[in-house]
Protein backbone atom coordinates (compact mmCIF):
# COMPACT_ATOMS: atom_id res chain seq x y z
CA UNK A 1 0.00 0.00 0.00
CA UNK A 2 1.26 3.47 -0.91
CA UNK A 3 1.29 5.57 2.25
CA UNK A 4 3.77 8.24 1.20
CA UNK A 5 3.13 11.80 0.18
CA UNK A 6 5.15 14.17 -1.95
CA UNK A 7 5.73 17.68 -0.65
CA UNK A 8 6.78 20.27 -3.22
CA UNK A 9 7.42 23.98 -3.35
CA UNK A 10 4.10 24.30 -5.21
CA UNK A 11 3.70 27.38 -7.39
CA UNK A 12 6.89 29.41 -7.66
CA UNK A 13 8.07 32.38 -9.67
CA UNK A 14 11.49 33.56 -10.70
CA UNK A 15 13.00 36.29 -12.82
CA UNK A 16 14.16 35.81 -16.38
CA UNK A 17 17.90 35.16 -16.42
CA UNK A 18 17.88 33.96 -12.85
CA UNK A 19 17.88 30.48 -11.40
CA UNK A 20 15.49 28.37 -9.36
CA UNK A 21 15.70 25.21 -7.29
CA UNK A 22 13.05 22.59 -7.98
CA UNK A 23 12.65 20.51 -4.85
CA UNK A 24 10.37 17.67 -3.79
CA UNK A 25 10.36 15.62 -0.62
CA UNK A 26 8.83 12.18 -0.09
CA UNK A 27 7.51 11.60 3.42
CA UNK A 28 5.29 9.24 5.42
CA UNK A 29 6.81 6.10 3.96
CA UNK A 30 9.77 3.87 4.70
CA UNK A 31 10.05 2.90 1.02
CA UNK A 32 13.49 3.10 -0.52
CA UNK A 33 13.91 5.76 -3.23
CA UNK A 34 15.70 4.12 -6.15
CA UNK A 35 15.27 6.77 -8.84
CA UNK A 36 13.91 10.29 -9.24
CA UNK A 37 12.89 11.69 -12.62
CA UNK A 38 12.47 15.41 -13.28
CA UNK A 39 10.19 15.92 -16.26
CA UNK A 40 7.99 18.31 -18.14
CA UNK A 41 4.87 16.97 -19.82
CA UNK A 42 6.72 16.39 -23.08
CA UNK A 43 10.33 15.74 -22.09
CA UNK A 44 12.68 14.50 -19.45
CA UNK A 45 15.07 16.99 -17.84
CA UNK A 46 17.07 14.75 -15.56
CA UNK A 47 17.23 11.42 -13.76
CA UNK A 48 18.93 10.66 -10.48
CA UNK A 49 19.38 6.89 -10.18
CA UNK A 50 20.69 5.30 -6.98
CA UNK A 51 23.11 3.10 -8.93
CA UNK A 52 23.87 5.16 -12.03
CA UNK A 53 23.97 8.67 -10.57
CA UNK A 54 22.72 11.71 -12.47
CA UNK A 55 21.73 11.92 -16.12
CA UNK A 56 20.95 15.35 -17.55
CA UNK A 57 19.14 15.61 -20.88
CA UNK A 58 21.34 17.15 -23.61
CA UNK A 59 18.59 19.74 -24.17
CA UNK A 60 19.23 21.07 -20.66
CA UNK A 61 22.91 20.24 -20.17
CA UNK A 62 24.06 23.85 -20.26
CA UNK A 63 21.62 25.21 -17.70
CA UNK A 64 20.55 22.42 -15.39
CA UNK A 65 22.60 21.41 -12.37
CA UNK A 66 21.96 18.37 -10.20
CA UNK A 67 20.88 18.99 -6.64
CA UNK A 68 20.70 20.05 -3.97
CA UNK A 69 19.96 16.50 -2.90
CA UNK A 70 17.44 14.95 -5.24
CA UNK A 71 16.35 18.39 -6.42
CA UNK A 72 17.28 20.22 -9.58
CA UNK A 73 18.65 23.70 -10.19
CA UNK A 74 17.44 25.40 -13.36
CA UNK A 75 19.62 28.30 -14.47
CA UNK A 76 19.51 31.09 -17.09
CA UNK A 77 15.73 31.06 -17.00
CA UNK A 78 13.70 32.18 -19.99
CA UNK A 79 9.97 32.84 -20.27
CA UNK A 80 9.75 29.56 -22.21
CA UNK A 81 10.61 27.76 -18.96
CA UNK A 82 7.23 28.74 -17.57
CA UNK A 83 5.14 25.65 -17.00
CA UNK A 84 4.68 22.51 -14.98
CA UNK A 85 7.52 20.34 -13.70
CA UNK A 86 7.08 16.84 -12.32
CA UNK A 87 9.21 15.03 -9.78
CA UNK A 88 8.66 11.29 -10.15
CA UNK A 89 9.92 9.19 -7.25
CA UNK A 90 10.48 5.51 -8.04
CA UNK A 91 10.42 3.59 -4.78
CA UNK A 92 10.59 0.05 -3.50
CA UNK A 93 8.28 -1.51 -2.55
CA UNK A 94 5.65 1.24 -2.85
CA UNK A 95 5.91 2.13 -6.54
CA UNK A 96 5.85 5.57 -8.11
CA UNK A 97 4.94 8.88 -6.49
CA UNK A 98 4.53 12.08 -8.51
CA UNK A 99 4.71 15.68 -7.37
CA UNK A 100 4.28 18.83 -9.42
CA UNK A 101 5.65 22.34 -9.35
CA UNK A 102 4.36 25.21 -11.47
CA UNK A 103 7.07 27.68 -12.40
CA UNK A 104 6.33 31.14 -13.72
CA UNK A 105 9.28 33.02 -15.19
CA UNK A 106 8.75 36.77 -15.04
CA UNK A 107 10.41 39.50 -17.01
CA UNK A 108 12.95 41.03 -14.66
CA UNK A 109 12.25 44.47 -13.21
CA UNK A 110 15.34 45.77 -15.05
CA UNK A 111 13.95 44.51 -18.32
CA UNK A 112 10.51 45.95 -17.53
CA UNK A 113 11.74 49.44 -16.75
CA UNK A 114 14.88 49.54 -18.87
CA UNK A 115 13.36 51.95 -21.37
CA UNK A 116 12.96 54.61 -18.65
CA UNK A 117 16.68 55.06 -18.10
Amino acid sequence: MMTGTIETTGNISAEKGGSIILQCHLSSTTAQVTQVNWEQQDQLLAICNADLGWHISPSFKDRVAPGPGLGLTLQSLTVNDTGEYFCIYHTYPDGTYTGRIFLEVLESSVAEHGARF
Epitope: D42, I47, I88
Partner: antibody, heavy 118, light 107 residues
Protein backbone atom coordinates in the same frame (compact mmCIF):
# COMPACT_ATOMS: atom_id res chain seq x y z
CA UNK B 1 -11.57 2.22 -13.01
CA UNK B 2 -10.29 4.21 -15.98
CA UNK B 3 -11.65 3.10 -19.34
CA UNK B 4 -11.11 4.52 -22.82
CA UNK B 5 -13.27 3.78 -25.86
CA UNK B 6 -12.59 4.85 -29.45
CA UNK B 7 -15.42 5.58 -31.87
CA UNK B 8 -15.75 6.81 -35.43
CA UNK B 9 -16.18 5.68 -39.03
CA UNK B 10 -14.35 2.51 -40.07
CA UNK B 11 -14.01 3.62 -43.70
CA UNK B 12 -12.64 6.93 -45.00
CA UNK B 13 -12.05 7.93 -48.61
CA UNK B 14 -8.59 9.06 -49.77
CA UNK B 15 -7.94 12.82 -49.43
CA UNK B 16 -10.69 13.14 -46.83
CA UNK B 17 -10.31 13.77 -43.10
CA UNK B 18 -10.30 10.92 -40.60
CA UNK B 19 -12.15 11.80 -37.38
CA UNK B 20 -12.16 9.69 -34.22
CA UNK B 21 -13.32 10.30 -30.67
CA UNK B 22 -12.14 8.73 -27.43
CA UNK B 23 -14.61 8.65 -24.55
CA UNK B 24 -13.03 8.37 -21.11
CA UNK B 25 -14.91 6.98 -18.14
CA UNK B 26 -13.74 6.71 -14.54
CA UNK B 27 -11.44 9.72 -14.72
CA UNK B 28 -11.75 13.36 -15.74
CA UNK B 29 -9.51 14.32 -18.64
CA UNK B 30 -9.09 17.78 -17.07
CA UNK B 31 -7.80 16.38 -13.76
CA UNK B 32 -4.37 15.14 -14.82
CA UNK B 33 -2.28 13.27 -17.39
CA UNK B 34 -1.99 13.58 -21.15
CA UNK B 35 -4.41 11.89 -23.51
CA UNK B 36 -2.86 10.31 -26.56
CA UNK B 37 -3.52 8.80 -29.97
CA UNK B 38 -1.37 5.90 -31.14
CA UNK B 39 -1.87 3.94 -34.35
CA UNK B 40 -0.83 0.58 -35.72
CA UNK B 41 -1.02 -0.32 -39.42
CA UNK B 42 -2.08 -3.94 -40.06
CA UNK B 43 0.78 -6.32 -39.18
CA UNK B 44 3.10 -3.44 -38.27
CA UNK B 45 4.38 -1.55 -35.25
CA UNK B 46 3.08 1.29 -33.11
CA UNK B 47 3.29 4.99 -33.94
CA UNK B 48 2.64 7.75 -31.41
CA UNK B 49 0.59 10.50 -33.06
CA UNK B 50 0.22 13.09 -30.34
CA UNK B 51 -1.56 14.11 -27.15
CA UNK B 52 -3.66 16.72 -25.49
CA UNK B 53 -2.73 17.35 -21.87
CA UNK B 54 -5.15 17.82 -19.00
CA UNK B 55 -4.53 21.56 -19.23
CA UNK B 56 -5.44 21.58 -22.93
CA UNK B 57 -2.03 21.93 -24.57
CA UNK B 58 -1.36 19.62 -27.51
CA UNK B 59 1.82 18.03 -28.84
CA UNK B 60 2.13 16.19 -32.17
CA UNK B 61 4.47 13.83 -33.93
CA UNK B 62 6.40 15.90 -36.51
CA UNK B 63 6.29 12.93 -38.91
CA UNK B 64 2.59 13.65 -39.43
CA UNK B 65 3.44 17.22 -40.37
CA UNK B 66 0.45 19.49 -40.01
CA UNK B 67 -2.12 16.82 -40.84
CA UNK B 68 -3.03 15.98 -37.25
CA UNK B 69 -5.15 17.87 -34.74
CA UNK B 70 -6.15 16.68 -31.27
CA UNK B 71 -8.88 18.51 -29.41
CA UNK B 72 -11.21 17.83 -26.50
CA UNK B 73 -14.77 18.25 -25.31
CA UNK B 74 -14.54 18.57 -21.55
CA UNK B 75 -18.32 18.51 -21.06
CA UNK B 76 -18.42 15.00 -22.54
CA UNK B 77 -15.03 13.90 -21.14
CA UNK B 78 -13.88 13.13 -24.68
CA UNK B 79 -10.87 13.91 -26.81
CA UNK B 80 -10.70 13.68 -30.57
CA UNK B 81 -8.33 13.06 -33.44
CA UNK B 82 -8.51 14.63 -36.88
CA UNK B 83 -6.13 13.49 -39.61
CA UNK B 84 -6.46 15.33 -42.90
CA UNK B 85 -5.58 14.37 -46.48
CA UNK B 86 -5.53 10.65 -45.72
CA UNK B 87 -4.06 8.00 -48.02
CA UNK B 88 -4.02 4.20 -47.95
CA UNK B 89 -0.95 4.43 -45.70
CA UNK B 90 -3.18 5.81 -42.95
CA UNK B 91 -5.10 2.54 -42.78
CA UNK B 92 -4.51 1.35 -39.21
CA UNK B 93 -5.97 0.44 -35.88
CA UNK B 94 -6.19 3.68 -33.91
CA UNK B 95 -5.82 3.55 -30.14
CA UNK B 96 -6.40 6.21 -27.54
CA UNK B 97 -4.24 5.92 -24.43
CA UNK B 98 -3.42 7.74 -21.21
CA UNK B 99 0.18 8.78 -20.64
CA UNK B 100 1.47 8.46 -17.10
CA UNK B 101 4.42 9.85 -15.17
CA UNK B 102 6.90 8.95 -16.54
CA UNK B 103 5.61 8.85 -20.11
CA UNK B 104 4.43 5.27 -20.39
CA UNK B 105 1.00 4.18 -21.62
CA UNK B 106 -0.79 2.17 -18.94
CA UNK B 107 -4.37 2.63 -20.10
CA UNK B 108 -5.50 1.93 -23.68
CA UNK B 109 -8.75 1.74 -25.57
CA UNK B 110 -9.47 -1.49 -27.40
CA UNK B 111 -8.66 0.16 -30.74
CA UNK B 112 -10.70 0.86 -33.84
CA UNK B 113 -9.72 -0.13 -37.36
CA UNK B 114 -9.94 2.63 -39.94
CA UNK B 115 -9.56 1.70 -43.59
CA UNK B 116 -8.73 4.34 -46.19
CA UNK B 117 -10.17 3.25 -49.50
CA UNK B 118 -12.31 4.60 -52.30
CA UNK C 1 13.84 11.41 -33.48
CA UNK C 2 15.12 8.62 -31.28
CA UNK C 3 15.03 5.30 -33.12
CA UNK C 4 14.35 2.14 -31.12
CA UNK C 5 15.67 -1.03 -32.76
CA UNK C 6 14.68 -4.54 -31.73
CA UNK C 7 17.26 -6.84 -33.28
CA UNK C 8 14.98 -9.87 -33.54
CA UNK C 9 11.65 -9.75 -35.32
CA UNK C 10 10.94 -13.33 -34.27
CA UNK C 11 12.03 -15.49 -31.36
CA UNK C 12 11.10 -19.12 -30.77
CA UNK C 13 11.31 -20.81 -27.35
CA UNK C 14 9.81 -23.60 -25.26
CA UNK C 15 7.74 -23.52 -22.09
CA UNK C 16 10.06 -23.01 -19.12
CA UNK C 17 12.83 -21.37 -21.18
CA UNK C 18 14.54 -18.15 -20.18
CA UNK C 19 13.94 -15.64 -22.98
CA UNK C 20 15.67 -12.30 -23.55
CA UNK C 21 14.34 -9.65 -25.94
CA UNK C 22 16.69 -6.80 -26.72
CA UNK C 23 16.19 -3.20 -27.77
CA UNK C 24 18.70 -0.52 -28.74
CA UNK C 25 18.12 3.24 -28.68
CA UNK C 26 19.82 5.49 -31.23
CA UNK C 27 20.96 7.83 -28.43
CA UNK C 28 21.37 7.75 -24.68
CA UNK C 29 17.92 7.66 -23.07
CA UNK C 30 19.20 6.86 -19.56
CA UNK C 31 16.53 4.55 -18.11
CA UNK C 32 13.55 6.02 -19.99
CA UNK C 33 12.32 2.84 -21.66
CA UNK C 34 9.05 0.92 -21.34
CA UNK C 35 8.08 -2.57 -22.54
CA UNK C 36 4.67 -3.73 -23.76
CA UNK C 37 3.08 -7.07 -24.55
CA UNK C 38 0.51 -7.28 -27.33
CA UNK C 39 -1.60 -10.35 -28.00
CA UNK C 40 -3.50 -10.80 -31.29
CA UNK C 41 -6.54 -8.55 -31.58
CA UNK C 42 -5.78 -6.76 -28.32
CA UNK C 43 -4.30 -3.43 -27.27
CA UNK C 44 -0.73 -3.42 -25.93
CA UNK C 45 -0.31 -3.91 -22.18
CA UNK C 46 2.38 -2.19 -20.14
CA UNK C 47 4.89 -4.54 -18.53
CA UNK C 48 7.90 -2.43 -17.55
CA UNK C 49 8.62 1.30 -17.29
CA UNK C 50 11.81 3.23 -16.53
CA UNK C 51 13.80 0.25 -17.84
CA UNK C 52 13.39 -1.98 -14.80
CA UNK C 53 10.22 -1.14 -12.87
CA UNK C 54 7.48 -3.75 -13.15
CA UNK C 55 4.02 -2.27 -13.63
CA UNK C 56 1.26 -3.14 -11.18
CA UNK C 57 0.01 -6.72 -11.54
CA UNK C 58 2.72 -7.85 -13.96
CA UNK C 59 4.05 -11.33 -13.08
CA UNK C 60 7.55 -11.30 -11.59
CA UNK C 61 8.87 -13.60 -14.32
CA UNK C 62 9.08 -10.40 -16.43
CA UNK C 63 12.20 -8.36 -15.70
CA UNK C 64 13.59 -5.29 -17.43
CA UNK C 65 17.21 -4.15 -17.41
CA UNK C 66 19.58 -1.77 -19.11
CA UNK C 67 20.43 1.92 -19.33
CA UNK C 68 21.87 4.31 -21.88
CA UNK C 69 21.23 2.69 -25.24
CA UNK C 70 20.89 -1.05 -24.55
CA UNK C 71 17.83 -2.60 -22.92
CA UNK C 72 16.58 -6.12 -22.29
CA UNK C 73 13.26 -7.66 -21.36
CA UNK C 74 13.73 -11.08 -19.78
CA UNK C 75 11.08 -13.74 -19.19
CA UNK C 76 12.62 -16.06 -16.61
CA UNK C 77 10.39 -19.07 -17.29
CA UNK C 78 8.30 -18.86 -20.42
CA UNK C 79 4.60 -19.69 -20.09
CA UNK C 80 2.21 -20.58 -22.92
CA UNK C 81 0.27 -17.34 -22.33
CA UNK C 82 3.42 -15.28 -23.00
CA UNK C 83 3.12 -15.88 -26.76
CA UNK C 84 2.74 -12.32 -28.05
CA UNK C 85 4.53 -9.44 -29.73
CA UNK C 86 6.76 -7.38 -27.42
CA UNK C 87 7.54 -3.71 -28.03
CA UNK C 88 10.00 -1.34 -26.42
CA UNK C 89 9.28 2.40 -26.26
CA UNK C 90 11.41 5.29 -25.12
CA UNK C 91 9.76 7.82 -22.83
CA UNK C 92 12.58 10.34 -22.98
CA UNK C 93 10.94 13.09 -25.03
CA UNK C 94 8.40 13.62 -27.76
CA UNK C 95 8.01 12.13 -30.26
CA UNK C 96 7.79 8.88 -28.33
CA UNK C 97 8.83 6.00 -30.56
CA UNK C 98 8.49 2.23 -30.38
CA UNK C 99 10.64 -0.61 -31.57
CA UNK C 100 9.31 -2.61 -34.50
CA UNK C 101 8.34 -5.48 -32.22
CA UNK C 102 9.58 -8.99 -31.45
CA UNK C 103 7.13 -11.82 -32.03
CA UNK C 104 7.63 -14.55 -29.47
CA UNK C 105 6.48 -17.99 -30.58
CA UNK C 106 6.44 -21.45 -29.02
CA UNK C 107 8.74 -24.15 -30.37
Amino acid sequence: QVQLQESGPGLVKPSQTLSLTCTVTGYSITSDYAWNWIRQPPGKGLEWMGYISYSGSARYNPSLKSRVTISRDTSKNQFSLKLSSVTAEDTATYYCARKGYPAYFAYWGQGTLVTVSS
Amino acid sequence: DIVMTQSHSFLSASVGDRVSITCKASQDVSTAVAWYQQKPGQAPELLIYSASYRYTGVPDRFTGSGSGTDFTLTISSLQAEDVAVYYCQHHYSTPYTFGQGTKLEMK
